[in-house]
Interface confidence: medium
């Protein structure tokens, strides 16, 4: 029995003065409690406790279920035990079959022994099958048997205790081992989109999806630079073992303006943190954005092909687009389309396939599109590049030479002087008059230029060049001149077309 | 002793509101995630809500999605059930209980229940 | 939400007797399966939990089995005590549901 010094308060002592004591199934266990300020004895065994406020504990007849530690407490909060071992050969174990541990962590196999002096107190396998080869456990006689680190694949292990007993071994009832795995990497966290576009009074929803081990995995959803508390709402399963799926879903029910910003999807647990943001844009109404891909002025050349092009940002979506060309809509030669596959696409594309455009053919094309909220347009000025065309090349009654051009761009006519039968006319004659006339076609059409020289001036046989030209090409007109004494006559006039 | 005690039930009119008490004992309370469950009179048992043990998660049964709210206090191992708008299908015995997240998300410890009776 | 759907919902038997109670999921939930036992005017006890491990302190006369979809609670040899009503319950997904319950009573 344990001795203090004089005055100290003492532990309570326990008759009879052992640690441990061993009694067969029937027997009675009387167990005394000495001390003048004696409390209560205690009984302990797995998950149960009994008290006595008597100082003497007396069982009868001893079951294998009074196996256990027996406490004496005093005043003072001083206490002595004694272990007591209750011998039933029906019964060897005392078993809680509640078996979790965590992922790394020690557990225990709660099976104390009702007999300590049975042999080869150990684990096995349920049905003869072994256990896992890494599998190392420490028994305790009186708790039951530790298993040391668990592991993540000992999950749903069955297993009993065994004890050899007169050369036989026995088992005890089967244990489920179930495991609660570490966190060892962050949670996984998606969106379901990275960024929401609303008007106001719009539903915003959004869902996050986390995904980790077990259903221990913290998430919330958050906005960026505040501290109010987000309405979400769950969603949660078991894919089978260790792989544990939340969704959470945040909606505001009708978004506002200022209900715009970055919201982020935060999920943590022991061994670290991940997240992931979405945006919100909020907009009074809708809108459309128009992108010229093109300058908005084009020249082409006659008979060659221009591809109109425009992108634009259109919220809601654009129901009506169109092309018109001179208060005409085109049926066909377009095509318009999403600039991505993106559920959240709001750009497009539109193109107006031009093919062979004539001179006639210039003009304002216009690209209209709409929406619930509004209408877009943007206008392409095409003007058609055309050699210059002689329209009219006389000897006017005033003896004036006079050649009218018209051509895109505006042509340049020159004039030149052969004398007598001599094939290039090379020496210039300066115009006495030039003037660009209005057009009486449609806009972006040819320009109309008139010049005029002096016939007078010409004083041999010879031939007179009107030469239109501009960046697409050129075309000539001759006036022949013979002299029949004064009188000067104007022969044949006749147009050579030069390349 | 583990325990789990409700209180803050009774009578109370339709429309009313009702807040449920559920004192925790005897274990770490904020390791556990805990839940509502309701029983009305001669029927089955409901789950009502869930929370985890920090308080972060919630969840409801679509019968009482935005009427009740779910809340705990780890620093007085109490759990709470706000109801609002109250409704006379809601008249049951309701018990809180705790989630053991071993065992399969089971109710492994039940408190004794606490009746609410909706009625005009 | 996933349908619970127990069977019998009620039945009768004697003491010593085998009962099998049935419990049906409307989809998958491995074994995220529990039973409980509910005597009138009182709590209900938790007896089996993931399908087929018996809850500390509960007699080895009960137990679970199943997976998937199809479960079953069985008392092996009934007693007085037992006469109460069970409920299966899926705790797979965060919404909870529980099965309508089978009352067994003395025959």
């Known amino acids: 029995q344990p001795s203090v010094s004089p005055g100290e308060p003492s532990p309570p002592s326990i008759h009879p003065g052992k640690s441990d004591l061993i009694v067969r199934v029937g027997d009675e266990i009387r167990l005394l409690c000495t001390d003048p300020g004696f409390v209560k004895w205690t009984f302990e065994i797995l998950d149960e406790t009994n008290e006595n406020k008597q100082n003497e504990w007396i069982t009868e007849k001893a079951e294998a279920t009074n196996t256990g530690k027996y406490t004496c407490t005093n005043k003072h909060g001083l206490s002595n035990s004694i272990y007591v071992f209750v011998r039933d050969p029906a019964k060897l174990f005392l078993v809680d079959r509640s078996l979790y541990g965590k992922e790394d962590n020690d557990t225990l196999v709660r099976c104390p022994l009702t007999d300590p002096e049975v042999t080869n107190y150990s684990l096995k396998g349920c049905q003869g099958k072994p256990l896992p080869k890494d599998l190392r456990f420490i028994p305790d006689p009186k708790a039951g048997i530790m298993i040391k680190s668990v592991k993540r694949a000992y999950h749903r292990l069955c297993l009993h205790c065994s004890v050899d007993q007169e050369g036989k071994s026995v088992l005890s009832e089967k244990f489920i081992l179930k495991v609660r795995p570490a966190f060892k990497a962050v949670p996984v966290v998606s969106v379901s989109k990275a960024s929401y576009l609303l008007r106001e009074g719009e539903e915003f929803t959004v869902t996050c999806t986390i995904k980790d081990v077990s259903s221990s995995v913290y998430s919330t959803w958050k906005r960026e630079n505040s501290q109010t508390k987000l309405q979400e709402k769950y969603n949660s399963w078991h894919h089978g073992d260790f792989n544990y799926e939340r969704q959470a879903t945040l909606t505001i029910s009708s978004a506002r303006v200022n209900d715009s910003g970055v919201f982020m999807c935060y999920a943590n647990n022991t061994f670290g943190s991940a997240n992931v943001t979405t945006t919100l844009e909020v907009v009074d109404k809708g809108f459309i954005n128009i992108f010229p891909m093109i300058n908005t002025t084009v020249f082409v050349n006659d008979g060659e092909n221009v591809d109109l092009i425009v992108e634009y940002e259109a919220f809601p979506k654009p129901e009506h687009q169109q092309w018109i060309y001179m208060n005409r809509t085109f049926t066909d030669k377009w095509e318009d389309y999403p600039k991505s596959e993106n559920e959240s696409n709001i750009r497009y594309v539109s193109e107006l396939h031009l093919t062979r455009l004539k001179g006639t053919e210039g003009g304002t094309y216009t690209f209209l599109v709409s929406n619930s909220d509004v209408n877009a347009a943007i206008a392409f000025n095409v003007y058609v590049n055309t050699k210059p065309e002689i329209l009219t090349y006389d000897r006017l009654v005033n003896g004036m030479l006079q050649c009218v051009a018209a051509g895109f761009p505006e042509p340049t006519i020159d004039w030149y002087f052969c004398p007598g039968t001599e094939q290039r006319c090379s020496a210039s004659v300066l115009p006495v008059d030039v003037q660009t006339l209005n057009s009486s076609g449609p806009p972006f059409g040819k320009l109309v230029v008139q010049s005029s020289i002096d016939s007078s001036a010409f004083k041999h046989n010879g031939t007179v060049e009107c030469k239109a030209y501009n960046d697409v090409g050129k075309t000539s007109a001759y006036f022949n001149f013979a002299f029949k004494g004064n009188n000067k006559e104007q022969i044949h006039p006749h147009t050579l077309f030069t390349p | 002793e583990v325990q789990l005690l409700e209180s803050g039930g009774g009578l109370v009119q339709p429309g009313g509101s009702l807040r449920l008490s559920c004192a925790a004992s005897g274990f770490s309370f904020s390791s556990y995630a805990m839940s509502w469950v309701r029983q009305a009179p001669g029927k089955g048992l409901e789950w009502v809500s869930a929370i985890s043990g920090t308080g972060g998660n919630t969840y409801y049964a679509d019968s009482v999605k935005g009427r009740f709210t779910i809340s705990r206090d780890n620093s007085k191992n109490t759990l709470y059930l706000q109801m609002n708008s109250l409704r006379a299908e809601d008249t049951a015995v309701y018990y809180c209980?705790?989630?053991?997240?071993?065992?399969?998300?089971?109710?492994?410890?039940w408190g004794q229940g606490t009746l609410v009776t909706v009625s005009s | 939400d996933i349908q619970m759907t127990q069977s019998p919902s009620s039945l009768s038997a004697s003491v010593g007797d085998r009962v099998t109670i049935t419990c049906r999921a409307s989809q998958n939930i491995y074994t995220y399966l529990n039973w409980y036992q509910q005597k009138p005017g009182k709590a209900p006890k938790l007896l089996i939990y993931?399908?087929?491990s018996l809850h500390s302190g509960v007699p080895s006369r009960f137990s679970g089995s199943g997976s998937g979809t199809d479960f079953t609670l069985t008392i092996s040899s009934l007693q007085p005590e037992d006469f109460a009503t069970y409920y299966c319950q899926q705790s797979y997904s965060s919404s909870i549901t529980f099965g309508g319950g089978t009352k067994v009573e003395i025959k």
């Open positions: 993931d399908a087929s």
């Open positions: 209980a705790r989630r053991n997240d071993f065992w399969s998300d089971a109710f492994d410890i």
